[in-house]
């Protein structure tokens, strides 16, 4: 094995090099030192390095890791938060322009039921908005909501229109007797099970998003341990400290620093590959009563039906829910 | 029949978030999405590789550093850590991740969790028409979960239909509705993906 | 060391196929993906589809989807690449690239195959 | 497709000068663009990608910038084994496209 050169006389080169790190010459010797006091650059003659540089250069090792990593994650960082970007946008805009295709529907085939109308379709499409993006509402309780509120105007303005409009009586019997006489027929539980289901996996796919992001992020602002900066300081810099600036570390023991540095980092990759798979069959999924965009866009339709189911029977419920709401409505006319 | 909103279905404007080609539909965006997160697939195993093949290692000269001496890149001597007796590589394996890494990898078991949970069952809902049509209360049997609803052509045929829309720099407003009755079905142009 | 090692030239008459293959090595197979590219005379290069060892996947440019079908052995971690149908237009050299880990770029490549359609 | 133009098509240069090539996609490509030296007779080999991030093992003479539709890509202080075709390759949509080359030679 060649011995290695003696270091340089003067510690010139060192301090040069140095100088790019650190700008103040102060802290390396001028020739080569004992360099007892060091700690990870141990010295089997004389070194010129002294204990403050050895520090700056395990300082500098982990900045280098840490950049490495950041250069390393940046593709997929961005891919990950340019596409939850791009779907929470999307989604807001599906949910805007069902809301608009619905009120559309009203305005040109029930005039009569606007505004009242808009404001419940409105009520409506905000739960959605806020449910996607993660509020604990309950989606068969919005569009119950939606129903509930929907009917005593249909009542009031299409079945039985020379009822007054302002009692709250009749409104709150109106209100019960929807689902007890399940006046809109299957309706209400059919929108609830599209609703539900395509809304719960657009907010775990947005969910899953997030997360993604939240994993690069962490691995790109990892501090590592003392020992690992120990470790990359000698394998970059400590042969600085014999005046070798030229010479570049063995491959495979920066294969096995590396494994050492990085171990817990990764631990991840079992629960990363599976993330990916499960994100990639949960989208495999996302199509029918499961895709939030086939079923918004084409709700308009189904609460047109419902109503037409309503107007259908409007007979027959006029009847059942004078006797219901007999009482209310007396009270009413007083 | 229902009115369909034609002229709200995008109105020449083509809803374009982050400048995606106007033809392109979520699915698809999606599909594009799984396509390129899969080639990140091993991401954490090359890391070590990654940051080696990025710093200053020898690969042409015959001598390298090992951590403590200059020795022949091919020799024993070159793999080993220089100076074993300082600190051990193997304890500080042992040590177990970082708190911060334990935490994100419970998150991902978490979500990992949910997303199992929460994907379709295959064959679930496949081979049936989307458009379905003549709808009555009732049809749909005890499981709703294979009804589109709507009836005749008041049913809107939606597969992805929204087309990404071009920054949006007006909100669509129910008052710019005309009144015709036109009925659309917008084409569903998917790029082709995966074929397995 | 990452290598991908393609077979040899070949010359084959108007009509049947060919199947050119692409060895692999100096990393995990099944966690990349595999391109094919193709580069006519004087021509720049096209990109022909791709394979996903993981599980199977392929993604074709539609140009190519009735003219190349795309095949993997994992136990030699070798893709295949077969062109049906061969005319003139399919004289090329074609090229297996490896994609992903810390991009969706095509990262390394073969040294190509030449492939020559003539009667 | 995303369509990429790529341009000039050929170029001469002096040793130790500096030579930038230019690629325009027919939209915007979220600066999914990688820059390839294409050898005779050997496979291409990636030089930049996602913009500006160099391989490994390539030296700092090259470099890549851009975004949105536009993007180049600039060698500096040319040495002889610079000599080759350059491609510019778009990858954000999944149909990816190649510029049409840029054949750099020396004066």
């Known amino acids: 094995q060649p011995p290695p050169p003696p270091p340089d006389a003067t510690c010139h080169q060192v301090r040069s090099f140095f100088q790019r790190l650190q700008p103040g010459l102060k802290w390396v010797p001028e020739t080569p030192v004992p360099g007892s006091d060091l700690q990870v650059c141990l010295p089997k003659g004389p070194t010129c390095c002294s204990r403050k540089m050895e520090e700056k250069y395990q300082l500098t090792a982990r900045l280098n890791m840490e950049q490495l990593l950041q250069s390393a994650s940046m593709e997929l960082k961005f891919l990950i938060i340019q596409n939850a970007a791009v779907f929470q946008e999307a989604f807001e805009i599906v949910v805007r322009h069902a809301k608009n295709y619905t009120n559309a529907m009203f305005k040109n085939n029930y005039p009569s039921l606007t505004p009242q109308a808009f404001e419940f379709v409105g009520e409506f499409f905000t739960d959605v908005s806020l449910y996607i993006l993660g509020s604990d509402i309950n989606v068969d309780d919005m569009v119950n909501e939606l129903f509930d509120s929907l009917f005593p105007v249909i009542y009031t303005q299409l079945m039985n229109p020379g009822l007054p409009d302002s009692a709250l009586d009749i409104n709150e019997c109106l209100r019960g007797a929807r689902r007890d006489l399940k006046v809109f027929g299957n309706f209400p539980k059919l929108i609830m099970t599209q609703v539900s289901k395509s809304l719960q996996v657009t907010r775990i796919f947005l969910q899953a998003l997030n997360l993604g992001i939240e994993v690069i992020n962490t691995t790109d602002h990892l501090k590592f341990s003392k020992d690992c900066g120990r470790m990359l300081t000698r394998m970059w810099y400590c042969s600085y400290c014999q005046g070798l600036m030229m010479v570049k570390p063995c491959g495979g023991y920066c294969n096995v620093v590396m494994q050492g540095c990085m171990a817990g980092v990764v631990e991840i990759d079992k629960y990363w590959r599976e993330y990916i798979l499960s994100l990639e069959e949960l989208v495999n999924g996302m199509y029918r009563i499961y895709d939030m965009e086939n079923v918004l866009l084409g709700l308009f339709s189904t609460i047109h039906d419902s109503i037409q189911y309503v107007q259908k029977n409007a007979g027959k419920l006029t009847t059942t829910i004078g006797k219901l709401c007999a009482h209310s409505q007396q009270r009413q006319y007083r | 029949s229902a009115y369909y909103p034609e002229d709200l279905f995008i109105d020449k404007k083509v809803l374009k978030v982050a400048h995606v080609e106007h033809e392109e539909t979520l699915s698809s965006r999606r599909r594009e999405l799984i396509q390129k997160l899969k080639s990140f697939i091993s991401f954490y195993s090359a890391l070590p590789g990654y940051i080696c093949s990025h710093s200053p290692v020898a690969e042409n000269d015959t001598l390298c550093w090992n951590g403590q001496e200059l020795v022949e890149r091919y020799s024993q001597k070159a793999a080993r850590n220089g100076m074993k007796n300082q600190f051990n590589l193997h304890e500080l394996k042992m040590k177990g991740p970082e708190p911060v890494v334990s935490q994100i990898i419970d998150k991902l078991k978490h979500i990992n969790q949910l997303l199992r949970t929460m994907s379709v069952p295959k064959g679930r809902v496949l081979d049936k028409n989307l458009d379905e049509e003549g709808f009555e209360s009732g049809d749909c049997g005890d499981d709703e979960d294979e009804c589109i609803g709507g009836s005749g052509d008041g049913m809107m045929k939606v597969k992805n239909q929204l087309r990404f829309l071009a920054e949006l720099a007006y909100d669509l407003d129910v008052d710019d509705v005309p009144g015709n009755n036109q009925q659309a079905t917008p084409k569903d142009n998917e790029i082709s993906t995966f074929h397995n | 060391e990452v290598q991908l090692q393609q077979s040899g030239p070949v010359m084959v008459k108007p009509g049947p196929s060919v199947k050119i293959s692409c060895q692999t090595s100096g990393f995990t197979f099944t966690d990349y993906y595999i391109h094919w590219v193709k580069q006519s005379h004087g021509k720049s290069l096209e990109w022909i589809g791709l394979?996903?060892?993981?599980?199977?996947?392929?993604n074709y440019n539609q140009k190519f989807k009735d003219k190349a079908t795309l095949t993997l052995d994992t136990s030699s971690s070798t893709a295949y690449m077969e062109l049906n149908s061969l005319t003139s237009e399919d004289s090329a050299v074609y090229y297996c690239a490896r994609a992903g880990g810390f991009s969706y770029a095509l990262n390394y490549w073969g040294q190509g195959t030449s492939v020559t359609v003539s009667s | 497709d995303i369509q990429m133009t790529q341009s000039p098509s050929s170029l001469s240069a002096s040793l130790g000068g500096k030579v930038t090539i230019t690629c325009k996609a027919s939209?915007?490509?979220?600066?999914?663009i990688a820059w390839y030296q294409h050898k005779p007779g050997k496979g291409p080999r990636l030089l930049i990608h996602f913009t500006s991030t160099l391989q490994p093992g390539i030296p700092s003479r090259f470099s890549g910038s851009g975004s949105g539709r536009d993007y180049s890509f600039s060698i500096s202080n040319l040495e002889p084994e610079d000599i080759a075709t350059y491609y510019c390759?778009?990858?954000?949509?999944?149909?990816?496209?190649f510029g049409a080359g840029t054949k750099l030679e020396l004066k």
């Open positions: 390759l778009q990858y954000d949509n999944l149909l990816l496209t």
């Open positions: 394979v996903f060892p993981y599980d199977g996947g392929t």
């Open positions: 939209q915007d490509i979220n600066n999914y």
